[in-house]
């Protein structure tokens, strides 16, 4: 019968006793930077080309016995998970292996850098189809390793890496912390985060998604027909590399940004038990388990968005946090979140010719996060319209006044330490969907975009009584682009998007005063692109 | 890697050369920074990646590496250039004493220097 991990990544319409996805990734080359491999293993024979690249440190230990089967164990298993005949994800993908880890699974940042450079030079000398680079390794945070990954990604290469097995914040490790890399955490057959002894999968905002990574059957280097079960975020990353290979084989022109958005979009949502993660990391960690798309074609009509969290600002009064979208993505909205509730809102601002989302801490606050909603919107022209604090009883408002521009997000930012909580909340006058409304002491920022066929609508969910969380979701066919809270008063901790749902968090109800102060409205802006839908229909 | 600790090839004689002049001094006001792994046991002191500014050409990378060797030799230090990077990042990998970091950070074109560190199979 089909191994649990292959079943888990297969959409229901393809499920059978055998794992037979429609395209095996035959147009894609996957580079594996790992240990040496047993290339004559029946699972991978003829599928993996061992390059002559080797850059590894000496093994540790007062007595070290080099056994080929032990030296090849990690890499052979991963090659099998990516493209193995029986237990592989992308059975048609061809692979090339580079040895950057020694027989004990240890390598160096410098060796990995030289390996990445080798791949880039190979790509220049002999350009082939889409390239996926699998980095099933991790070290401490490294500026230079992250920079090399960024350069390779900007050359059109898709990099997939292990989040790390340290039961820790993935942002403290490289290449897991490189924003351009697809970083993969590990889950088990119960869709729970993988525990590895005292340790386990890494988590946090630097993880893009999770994938099967416990008890994964794959090629064993003990013999040419042996199989073995291994666990770790390397195995999880290998699944995503295989899925990426299949998606790229079906749509070779996909950019990294498009691929990442699709991986997120087709993942299983909200199946991971977040209680396993440290409390302060739960909101930052994506609750996504990778899966193949139900159909390899025809996803192009969708408006894809993802949520990007910034690093924590730190507690100083003037501290700020910045969240950025990938180069090919549009920032369609910006929100902020603070666990203490002490924040001064957020705003979108230009930085290096691109919009970024900046959140502001307040005096006595423990720090803030900026949350960017990053979307794929071809031919988009977006700008930010700002209204300064109105000081009028009706509150501050701003709208998209340019012809053909629609509202995709609202942000508010205030200079005062605490927005007055005694004033009644201002709710949006009905029938004015292109308008942002906020507290009279706040400046309001509207993200206004023009793109072919783009249409958006505002959806609100207000509750009169205090509640820790208010949510509002976009319906089928619409994509959440903006998420904000009304009013912006101090008991609101902030707003953020989780998949297609806008979440507004408030202080613990027991600490909230009157019910009028507790009234909170979650405001979602839901968009779709008729243009993308038409283009997709024309293709079919 | 072919070399072992203490086995320094390419020993550089302390010859005064055009490489050792002060032409191409670092641009005013720009300070190169030094980075190392926050996890001490994973550090590999003695090997450093010298990353040069983005538009640096291969010839300049090689020249900067030779200049470092010459200046180090004048101070009685042996260095070994293990690799010159080009294609992804401009720069070079050098085996040298940590005592030379201050000197290396002042070289022209240097953006930052990172001490090598370990990575592990996951």
């Amino acid at each position: 019968s089909i191994p649990w991990n292959l079943e888990r990544i297969t959409p229901p319409r393809y499920r059978a006793d055998e794992y037979q996805p429609p395209d095996g990734g035959s147009l894609v080359e996957v580079y594996l930077l790992d240990t040496s491999i047993q290339s004559d293993h029946r699972e991978i024979e003829g599928r993996v080309m061992v390059t002559d690249f080797e850059n590894v440190p000496e093994e540790d230990g007062t007595r070290f016995h080099r056994q080929a089967s032990k030296c090849d164990s990690h890499g052979t298993h991963l090659a099998g998970v990516v493209s193995g005949r029986d237990a592989g994800v992308a059975k048609g993908a061809s692979m090339r292996s580079l040895r950057v880890l020694n027989c004990q699974g240890k390598g160096t940042v410098s060796g990995t850098l030289i390996g990445l450079e080798f791949i880039r030079k190979s790509q220049l000398v002999q350009p082939v189809g889409p390239l996926v680079v699998l980095l099933p390794l991790a070290g401490g945070y490294s500026r230079v390793l992250n920079a090399a990954c960024q350069r390779l990604a900007s050359a059109g290469v898709v990099l997939v890496t292990a989040a790390g097995n340290f039961r820790d914040d993935a942002c403290l490790y490289s290449p897991a912390s490189a924003p351009e890399v697809i970083t993969v955490g590990a889950t088990n057959a119960q869709d729970q985060p993988v525990t590895l002894g005292t340790l386990g999968t890494n988590f946090g905002r630097c993880v893009d998604l999770f994938a099967p990574g416990e008890d994964i059957i794959g090629a064993s280097s003990d013999c040419s027909t042996c199989f073995v079960s291994q666990s770790g975020t390397s195995q999880a990353a290998a699944h995503v590399a295989g899925i990426a290979a299949m998606m790229l084989s079906a749509e070779p022109e996909l950019t990294l940004a498009e691929l990442r958005q699709r991986l997120i979009h087709f993942s299983a949502k909200d199946v991971i038990n977040e209680a396993w993660f440290p409390e302060d990391q739960r909101v930052l960690t994506p609750n996504l388990v990778a899966a193949l798309p139900p159909s390899t074609h025809g996803a192009g009509w969708q408006l894809f968005c993802r949520t990007v969290w910034s690093a924590h600002s730190g507690p100083t009064r003037m501290a700020t946090a910045v969240a950025r979208c990938a180069p090919d993505e549009e920032l369609l909205s910006c929100s902020s979140f603070s666990r203490s509730g002490k924040r001064r809102g957020e705003r979108m601002e230009a930085q290096g010719g691109k919009l970024v989302c900046r959140a502001h801490n307040a005096f006595g606050g423990e720090g803030v996060y900026a949350i960017a909603r990053c979307c794929l919107l071809p031919q988009a022209n977006c700008s930010v319209h700002t209204a300064p604090p109105a000081e009028a009883s009706m509150g501050t408002r701003v709208h998209c006044h340019q012809q053909g521009h629609v509202l995709t997000g609202c942000s508010s930012h205030w200079e005062v330490e605490d927005l007055g909580t005694h004033k009644p909340p201002v709710l949006r006058p009905r029938g004015q969907p292109n308008q942002c409304v906020g507290h009279r002491e706040a400046s309001i920022h509207a993200s206004c975009c023009h793109a072919p066929g783009l249409e958006c609508k505002v959806k609100e969910h207000g509750i009169p009584a205090p509640q820790e969380q208010v949510t509002v979701a976009c319906e089928e066919g619409w994509t959440l682009t903006g998420c904000s809270a009304l009013p912006g008063t101090s008991h609101v901790l902030g707003a953020y998007a989780v998949d297609n749902t806008c979440v507004v968090r408030s202080r613990d109800v027991s600490t909230t005063g009157s019910t009028s102060e507790g009234a909170v409205t979650a405001v979602a802006i839901c968009c779709r692109s008729r243009h993308l839908a038409q283009a997709s229909q024309e293709l079919q | 890697q072919e070399d072992e600790d203490g086995d320094y090839e390419e020993l550089v004689l302390a010859l005064r050369s055009e490489e050792d002049g002060l032409a191409e001094a670092p641009e005013h006001g720009t300070t190169a920074t030094f980075h190392r792994c926050a996890k001490d046991p994973w550090r590999l002191p003695g090997t450093y990646v010298v990353v040069l500014k983005e538009e640096t050409h291969l010839s300049q990378s090689e020249r900067t590496a030779r200049r470092l060797q010459a200046q180090a030799a004048r101070r009685g230090y042996l260095t070994k250039i293990l690799h010159v990077f080009h294609g992804l990042l401009p720069g070079f990998l050098v085996k040298m004493s940590g005592d030379l970091l201050e000197l290396a950070l002042k070289l022209p074109h240097v953006d930052y220097i990172e001490e090598d560190s370990s990575v592990f199979a996951q």
Partner: antibody, heavy 122, light 111 residues
Framework: QVQLVQSGAEVKKPGSSVKVSCKAS????????MHWVRQAPGQGLEWMGL????????YYADSAKGRFTISRDNSKNTLYLQMNSLRSDDTAVYYC???????????????WGQGTTVTVSS | QSALTQPPSVSGSPGQSVTISCTGT????????VSWYQQLPGTAPKLMIY???KRPSGVPDRFSGSKSGNTASLTISGLQTGDEADYYC???????????FGTGTRVTVLG
């Protein structure tokens, strides 16, 4: 649950040998390095040695070198400590302990056996 | 194998905080991860802290670790009678190519 179960107490004469075992359960034994640690009566902990998860590498304390050998049988999920030329100062409780993770955390011990008392007396 | 240096004993009343120091050299604590172990009377040691300041799941957050230079510290806040035990620090020593434990500290809860 995860546990290490050690063999029973031993009483030995000076100059003799003994082999202590440690059987692992409820975890993937061949994924973890293993340590031996001893504790003489009323004394502190003394590390004896470490064996890599696949048996390919090892380290020993000076006091164990030459006389003590650590081995493992991954097919039986069992770790061994062979002690030769026993002396009276080898009298101690011997603990096996699991190394916390892969190579990057081999040196912390997160699961301990219940201990085996070895008494060396004439 | 020379041990890391710990005070022989520390004591405190219930609810108080106590700190145990562990002093080594640059070849162990200064450049290696430090772990802390608790040994209750008559039982095997138990890992309380690893990599200077991380707690395995199940270890209360009353236990915290830190490191400065060649000295590591374990702080037990909100002391409880169940915390009475011997505590050992431990670290790899790169010059010895071996693991070294601290001399051990007995924690006594008064009253």
């Amino acid at each position: 649950q995860v546990q290490l179960v050690q063999s029973g107490a031993e009483v030995k004469k000076p100059g003799s040998s003994v082999k202590v075992s440690c059987k692992a359960s409820a975890f993937t034994f061949d994924s973890f390095g293993m340590h031996w640690v001893r504790q003489a009566p009323g004394q502190g902990l003394e590390w004896m040695g470490l064996l890599w998860s696949d048996g390919s590498g090892e380290y020993y304390a000076d006091s164990a070198k030459g006389r003590f050998t650590i081995s493992r049988d991954n097919s039986k999920n069992t770790l061994y400590l062979q002690m030769n030329s026993l002396r009276s100062d080898d009298t101690a409780v011997y603990y096996c302990a699991r190394a916390m993770g892969a190579i990057y955390y081999y040196y912390a011990m997160d699961v301990w056996g219940q201990g085996t008392t070895v008494t060396v007396s004439s | 194998q020379s041990a890391l240096t710990q005070p022989p004993s520390v004591s405190g009343s219930p609810g108080q905080s106590v700190t145990i120091s562990c002093t080594g050299t640059s070849s162990n604590i200064g450049n290696q991860f430090v772990s802390w172990y608790q040994q209750l009377p008559g039982t095997a040691p138990k890992l309380m802290i690893y990599e200077y300041n991380k707690r395995p799941s199940g270890v209360p957050d009353r236990f915290s670790g830190s490191k400065s230079g060649n000295t590591a510290s374990l702080t037990i806040s909100g002391l409880q009678t169940g915390d009475e035990a011997d505590y050992y620090c431990g670290s790899w020593d790169s010059s010895l190519s071996g693991y070294v434990f601290g001399t051990g500290t007995r924690v006594t809860v008064l009253g």
